[in-house]
């Protein structure tokens, strides 16, 4: 009689996370009598996965009915595979005894787990920046395997080229993470812009994952001010308007000063929105000319989004 061989026909098996892995093993003889055990890894630290003789292995089922006469198929199925299950699995024949002793091992089957990357998370700078400044965005995705992955950056559908990407760890691992930083130059038109991080991986079947960041969270467009004097509305009254244009975000406070003294403070409320997403607002001040002997310096002072105030002045002539 030929000596028993343990045959593991698959050198490697690749399974998507969450699925079941079937690990094939057959023996070529009924002799010697004794159980089959499955291990992950080799040597003294190997991990018992299944023991035909005894134990409780809730995730493992035998593929064939191992109690049936002349059964030589000891393939197993492991359910709900996770990246932590990756490794080399050995089917080992034991010889009956007290205790049973290891008789022969199969060559092993390497199980690799295809882990889907997590949804990319894009984060921008902590503080807002103004047009013409360069800001950095980061994109992170975790838990994927194998290591090969493609990451692209887009701004409004246009691919970006100024970015750096790292995949960790560098060596072998059950799963990997990707981290990328892209540099984006802001323009005044970016309130409605989006930055997109796109991740492509073998587990996604050609359907990449995307993470987005709205530049509206990042950009600050400072206002332009224009102070104008309107025709006299009534005797001794002049209407002065302050046009606050093209600002973003909306948070804005305006103060009128007459000769340096605070006349009125108000917060932007009824704004109008421009096509590019910025806002316009107008404030007006009625000045009683008869109350002034000399010329009046009117100043429109605007504090936008917590930034230092900007102002525009207008000299109101008081005729004798």
């Amino acid at each position: 009689e030929e000596e028993l061989q343990v045959i593991q026909p698959d050198k490697s098996v690749s399974v998507a996370a969450g699925e079941s892995a079937i690990l094939h093993c057959t023996v070529t003889s009924l002799i010697p009598v004794g159980p089959i055990q499955w291990f992950r890894g080799a040597g003294p630290a190997r991990e018992l996965i299944y023991n035909q003789k005894e134990g409780h292995f809730p995730r493992v089922t035998t593929v064939s009915e191992s109690t049936k006469r002349e059964n030589m198929d000891f393939s197993i199925s492991i359910s709900n595979i996770t990246p932590a299950d990756a490794g080399t699995y050995y089917c080992v024949k034991f010889r009956k005894g007290s205790p049973d002793t290891e008789f022969k091992s199969g060559a092993g089957t390497e199980l690799s787990v295809r882990g889907k990357p997590s949804a990319p998370v894009v984060s921008g700078p902590a503080a807002r920046a103004t047009p013409q400044h360069t800001v950095s965005f980061t994109c992170e995705s975790h838990g994927f395997s194998p290591r090969d992955i493609t990451l692209k950056w887009f701004k409004n559908g246009n691919e970006l080229s100024d970015f750096q990407t790292n995949v960790d760890p560098v060596g072998e691992s059950v799963s990997y993470s990707i981290h990328s930083t892209a540099k984006v130059v802001l323009t005044r038109e970016d309130v409605h812009s989006q930055v997109i991080c796109e991740v492509a991986h073998v587990t996604l079947q050609g359907d990449p994952l995307r993470g987005t960041a709205n530049l509206s969270e990042t950009i600050r467009v400072p206002p332009t001010l224009e102070v104008t004097q309107q025709p006299v509305r009534a005797e001794n009254q002049v209407n002065v308007t302050c046009q606050v244009r093209k600002f973003y975000p909306q948070r804005l406070q305006l103060t009128w000063l007459e000769n340096g003294n605070v006349s009125r403070t108000e917060t932007a409320s009824t704004v109008t929105e421009n096509k590019d997403g910025t806002y316009n607002w107008m404030s007006w001040l009625l000045v009683n000319v008869s109350a002034h002997r000399d010329d009046v310096k009117l100043t429109c002072q605007v504090e936008h989004d917590g930034q230092p105030a900007v102002s525009k002045s207008h000299d109101l002539k008081v005729s004798a």
């Epitope: 009924l30 002799i31 134990g55 109690t67």
Partner: antibody
Framework: QVQLVQSGAEVKKPGASVKVSCKAS????????INWVRQAPGQGLEWIAM????????HYNQIFKDRATLTTDTSTSTAYMELRSLRSDDTAVYYC????????????WGRGTLVTVSS | DIVLTQSPDSLAVSLGERATINCRAS??????????IFWYQQKPGQPPKLLIY???NRDSGVPDRFSGSGSGTDFTLTISSLQAEDVAVYYC????????FGQGTKLEIK
């Protein structure tokens, strides 16, 4: 280690039934066949039947097919052999035995249960 | 049904001598490349103990003075050098179909 612990001796009257138990330990009960064998005083071994606890598949010796019933309780890893319509020539030691190689052989044996049938 | 007939019914052998027990099947017990014959030893007051499986393979812990041979219908259990502790009744069993036992051979010391 594998152990098969059988229930105690029984004395039964002719026509009665007996149910012998065999509690298994030291191995996964559902992974191996259990055989039942009897031995009348001073006589040889006689195979009665076998059961696969994983699915309750049974095979019976034709001689016992109408009188013997094998069952298992997987929650307690216990096998049972019930023999009905007892006669005096059913007096014997009844053994359970575990088949470790699925070869329809008997690798590990219980110590036996003496069933005496007497009026 | 396959019937197994053992011979002799009883046997007396001197210590250190060879003991041979035969088992003949009423039809071949060979199937799938294996001879489905098993040998058991039973000492008084004890359950049987498996000695040989599939005609020629010693079970674990069985001394190597015990050996099994044969094919098809004729099988032999040999004890190469009889020891006092080998006094017992020996049974063959087949499982080519559903199991049956031979009638047993009583081995004593001469």
């Amino acid at each position: 280690q594998v152990q098969l612990v059988q229930s105690g001796a029984e004395v039964k009257k002719p026509g009665a039934s007996v149910k012998v138990s065999c509690k298994a330990s030291g191995y996964t009960f559902t992974n191996y066949w259990i055989n039942w064998v009897r031995q009348a005083p001073g006589q040889g071994l006689e195979w009665i039947a076998m059961i696969d606890p994983s699915d309750s598949e049974t095979h019976y010796n034709q001689i016992f097919k109408d009188r013997a019933t094998l069952t298992t309780d997987t929650s307690t890893s216990t096998a049972y052999m019930e023999l009905r319509s007892l006669r005096s020539d059913d007096t014997a030691v009844y053994y359970c035995a575990m088949d470790y190689g699925s070869l329809y052989a008997m690798d590990y044996w219980g110590r036996g249960t003496l069933v005496t049938v007497s009026s | 049904d396959i019937v197994l007939t053992q011979s002799p019914d009883s046997l007396a052998v001197s210590l250190g001598e060879r003991a041979t027990i035969n088992c003949r099947a009423s039809q071949s017990v060979r199937s799938s490349g294996y001879n489905w014959i098993f040998w058991y030893q039973q000492k008084p007051g004890q359950p049987p103990k498996l000695l040989i499986y599939l005609a020629s393979n010693r079970d674990s812990g069985v001394p190597d003075r015990f050996s099994g041979s044969g094919s098809g219908t004729d099988f032999t259990l040999t004890i190469s050098s009889l020891q006092a502790e080998d006094v017992a009744v020996y049974y063959c069993q087949h499982s080519r179909e559903l199991p049956t036992f031979g009638q047993g051979t009583k081995l004593e010391i001469k």
